[in-house]
């Protein structure tokens, strides 16, 4: 018969014959022959191959470098790479998550509307009238002004978006 010019899925063409690809998690040791099947070997510890392949070397698992703020989100297997994510309070600088930066803090006068995730930064919002934030924080929302009336006190100093109201005693009526 004529030698094949194309092979089926999960096969590759070599020396005019179709050989089986190695399955994910295994690397190629030797091509098939007329008499022998393709020889494959499992990837070693901390190695992987994630496709049907004819690679002679497995890929190294990604290293999640703690000096770059990274930690392991999902441990790699022989078929999958390690997935890194950022330490609490940090987020990735790129889609590949090769390093991390601190989440944006909301300045005094602003509160956190949405806490940051691994792929998006903190969303800040200006504190509306009746609310304040006196700290720079990536977690704190705007706080409501103290209600002096509920404490039988009066407002001695108005609040701002950065400061709480100051309450004081009511003036006693003179007899």
């Amino acid at each position: 018969p004529e030698p094949p010019t194309a092979c089926r899925e999960k096969q590759y063409l070599i020396n005019s014959q179709c050989c089986s690809l190695c399955q994910p998690g295994q690397k190629l040791v030797s091509d098939c022959t007329e008499f022998t099947e393709t020889e494959c070997l499992p990837c070693g510890e901390s190695e992987f191959l994630d496709t049907w392949n004819r690679e002679t070397h497995c890929h190294q698992h990604k290293y999640c470098d703690p000096n770059l703020g990274l930690r392991v989100q999902q441990k790699g297997t022989s078929e999958t790479d390690t997935i890194c994510t950022c330490e609490e309070g940090w987020h990735c600088t790129s889609e590949a998550c090769e390093s991390c930066v601190l989440h944006r803090s909301c300045s005094p006068g602003f509160g956190v509307k949405q806490i940051a995730t691994g792929v998006s930064d903190t969303i800040c919002e200006p504190c509306p009238v009746g609310f304040f934030s006196n700290v720079s924080s990536a977690f704190e929302k705007c706080h409501p002004w103290t209600s002096c009336e509920t404490k039988d006190l009066v407002v001695q100093q108005a609040g701002t978006n950065k400061t709480d109201v100051v309450c004081g005693p009511q003036d006693r009526l003179r007899a």
Epitope: T93, S94, C106, S107, D121, I123
Partner: antibody, heavy 121, light 107 residues
Framework: QVQLVESGGGVVQPGRSLRLSCAAS????????MHWVRQAPGKGLEWVAL????????YYADSVKGRFTISRDNSKNTLYLQMNSLRAEDTAVYYC??????????????WGQGTLVTVSS | DIQMTQSPSSVSASVGDRVTITCRAS??????LAWYQQKPGKAPKLLIY???SLQSGVPSRFSGSGSGTDFTLTISSLQPEDFGNYYC?????????FGQGTKVEIK
């Protein structure tokens, strides 16, 4: 290369509804927050709505809150804007916008060509 | 909401001129500012982000500076293709807001 293609614009009467779509390609759609930004004829830019990368949170400009709904289908790489109770002041070109993401979140790095919505009786 | 005010509203300059556009925020926005260019009938294009970082593919004649409330976009040597509208945008806090725009015309 990144491509954002909007569709669904047109002429609609006040009080009626319209749904805009945006087909995204050339980037990992499911990793990025997306926005809608609009521009009334001869006017400036106005941010309209945001949806997070996984659709878990959504934010709206006060001018459209309660009337517009942003959504996404990551399996189809598509962003949507459902616009109900349309008003004359919603007349604008609507742009589908990719968030720059990660350490550059809330900057808008790629924009679609825009789709015109005209609200008129 | 944070108001963004641009000046001038329009500028007419010759090829080779240095053009400066300013943007003022109503509150401190640190360095969370972007500049966009929009040509007639086209979508805006990101030029500068984080106040001074040049977006990939943007010519180096564009530069940004400033922090806090006052920001500047500079075109060091105006080219014929630089005409259009320029907008600043604050990315410090929700809701994200734009300046009203500056129209750049070539003399």
């Amino acid at each position: 290369q990144v491509q954002l293609v909007e569709s669904g614009g047109g002429v609609v009467q006040p009080g009626r509804s319209l749904r805009l779509s945006c087909a995204a390609s050339g980037f990992t759609f499911s990793n990025y927050a997306m926005h809608w930004v609009r521009q009334a004829p001869g006017k400036g830019l106005e941010w309209v709505a945001l949806i997070s990368f996984d659709g878990s949170y959504k934010y709206y400009a006060d001018s459209v809150k309660g009337r517009f709904t942003i959504s996404r289908d990551n399996s189809k790489n598509t962003l949507y804007l459902q616009m109900n109770s349309l008003r004359a002041e919603d007349t604008a070109v609507y742009y589908c916008v990719k968030d720059a993401g990660y350490s550059s979140s809330w900057f808008f790095d790629y924009w679609g060509q825009g789709t015109l919505v005209t609200v008129s009786s | 909401d944070i108001q963004m005010t641009q000046s001038p509203s329009s500028v007419s300059a010759s090829v080779g001129d240095r053009v400066t556009i300013t943007c003022r925020a109503s509150q401190d926005i640190s360095s969370w500012l972007a500049w966009y260019q929009q040509k007639p009938g086209k979508a805006p294009k990101l030029l500068i982000y984080a106040a001074s970082s040049l977006q990939s593919g943007v010519p180096s004649r564009f530069s940004g500076s400033g922090s806090g409330t006052d920001f500047t976009l500079t075109i060091s040597s105006l080219q014929p293709e630089d005409f259009g509208n320029y907008y600043c945008q604050q990315a410090n806090s929700f809701p994200w807001t734009f300046g009203q725009g500056t129209k750049v015309e070539i003399k």
